[in-house]
């Protein structure tokens, strides 16, 4: 009778993480009598995966009944596969011995490769806000995928970006890999509604890439433009002065009126109007009683936006018998009546 051979028909097996791997092994003879064992790796450091005779291997089940007489099928299934299970598995026949069984013959080995999906990409932007025309960096990270081959793309509002650098770690062989990419984005005033998207494509995703997003509203600061105007006379000896605060983002804004350099009133932007591009407009106005003044008055609208240094705009109010109409009427943007009589 021919000497027993251990046949592992599959040189390699590819399994998705979380699924079950079947490792096939058959013997060509029942002789010599003795158990089989499965190992991962070869040599003295090999790891025991299954022992027919003894031990507890909760993730391993045999395909056939190894206790059955004449059984020569020693295939096993390993459940809930993870990338850490990757490696070469050997089916080894032992010959019954005393006191210990003796290794008789090994199969050629089956390489188990594990396909693991990348984690959802996480996109993070700069810690501090930046203003239009500035370049900011965004990072994208995804972990735990295998095999190593992966594609990463950046988009801004659907337009692919080209200014980015990507690394996949580790460089050498590993059970799973991570990707890290940094993209540079130039901000514009219209970017409040913009999105930056990191897209990851991998063989495990079957053509349906994973995406991570960052809203530029978390990154951009659009400073306001100020315009101070004198409105027509509202009543005898009263002048309406408005400060138009336009195209700012985010909403956090504080406005202070100064008369001849002295603080007259401070208020916080509340009832703002939103522009189509996501920026805000706001208007504050002041009623000035000019009859109480002998000299001209310098009115200053000072705005502190999002914790930045204040910007201001001034208007010289001429004290004369009949104040002239100045500026334009933008009552549609009027947000409230802030009356101030000057005595």
């Amino acid at each position: 009778e021919e000497e027993l051979q251990v046949i592992q028909p599959d040189k390699s097996v590819l399994v998705a993480a979380g699924e079950t791997a079947t490792l096939r092994c058959t013997a060509t003879s029942l002789i010599p009598v003795g158990p089989i064992q499965w190992f991962r790796g070869a040599g003295p450091g090999r790891e025991l995966i299954y022992n027919q005779k003894e031990g507890h291997f909760p993730r391993v089940t045999t395909v056939s009944d190894l206790t059955k007489r004449n059984n020569m099928d020693f295939s096993i299934r390993i459940g809930n596969i993870t990338p850490a299970d990757a490696g070469t598995y050997y089916c080894v026949k032992f010959r019954k011995g005393s006191p210990d069984d003796v290794e008789f013959k090994s199969g050629a080995g089956t390489e188990l490769s594990v396909r693991a999906k990348p984690s959802a990409p996480v996109v993070s932007g700069p810690a501090a806000r930046a203003t239009p025309q500035h370049t900011v960096s965004f990072t994208c990270e995804s972990h735990g995928f295998s095999p190593r081959d992966i594609t990463l793309k950046w988009f801004k509002n659907g337009n692919e970006l080209s200014d980015f650098q990507t690394n996949v770690d580790p460089v050498g062989e590993s059970v799973s890999y991570s990707i890290h990419s940094t993209a540079k984005v130039v901000l514009t005033r219209e970017d409040v509604h913009s999105q930056v998207i990191c897209e990851v494509a991998h063989v495990t995703l079957q053509g349906d890439p994973l995406r991570g997003t960052a809203n530029l509203s978390e990154t951009i600061r659009v400073p306001p433009t100020l315009e101070v105007t004198q409105q027509p006379v509202r009543a005898e000896n009263q002048v309406n002065v408005t400060c138009q605060v336009r195209k700012f983002y985010p909403q956090r804004l504080q406005l202070t009126w100064l008369e001849n350099g002295n603080v007259s009133r401070t208020e916080t932007a509340s009832t703002v109007t939103e522009n189509k591009d996501g920026t805000y407009n706001w208007m504050s106005w002041l009623l000035v009683n000019v009859s109480a003044h002998r000299d001209d008055v310098k009115l200053t609208c000072q705005v502190e936006h999002d914790g930045q240094p204040a910007v201001s705009k001034s208007h010289d109010l001429k004290v004369s018998a009949h104040p002239k109409e100045q500026g334009s009427n933008t009552a549609a943007e009027n947000t409230g009546s802030n009356e101030r009589n000057i005595y």
Epitope: I31, T61, R69, N70
Partner: antibody, heavy 123, light 105 residues
Amino acid sequence: VTLDESGGGLQTPGGALSLVCKGSGFTFSSHAMNWVRQAPGKGLEWVAGISSDGRFTYYGAAVQGRATISRDNGQSTVRLQLNNLRAEDTATYYCTKNGGCGSGGDLDCIDAWGHGTEVIVSS
Amino acid sequence: ALTQPASVSANPGETVEITCSGGGSNNAYGWFQQKSPGSAPLTVIYDNGKRPSDIPSRFSGSKSDSTGTLTITRVQAEDEAVYYCGSADNSGAGVFGAGTTLTVL
């Protein structure tokens, strides 16, 4: 080692029976179990067998498709259910234990027998 | 089914052999003693040559090629019984022989 069968008695043709065997005096979960029957005046006939962990079951040709063998290692019991009973199922049914070898159907490994339970299928 | 002789006989003190063939390739044989119809069989040999602890050493089993043999040395009157051999066929199904009646003269 003790194997106690129960569940026999008079059965009607076309009906179903459920035999239970309780094992004691040995590590039940380590041994394959078989059911063997003997019709009056006849020899021994293998009916069904089950592996020690219960994952694998085996059936004789005469009962294939009508029988189900199962085991509960926690309760140290093995059960044989036989449906669509026929007159030729009339026999004494023995529960057997395998020694430290073989599985269901490997009769060379039987090392212990129960006392048997008699089943009569008759209208 | 397995093939075994329908009957054998021996005088007390003699040695008797009962053969069994037809098991699956490389399979083993077990031997079961039944003293009367309806009484529970008793295993005298399993796994070719293993003897349960309560079985006298006069009973032994062996296998050569594909034939199993039950040997009873120094036969006694109480050994009179029907002896069945058991194994599995190549498909894994359990099979018994038709039984051999041992008569002690």
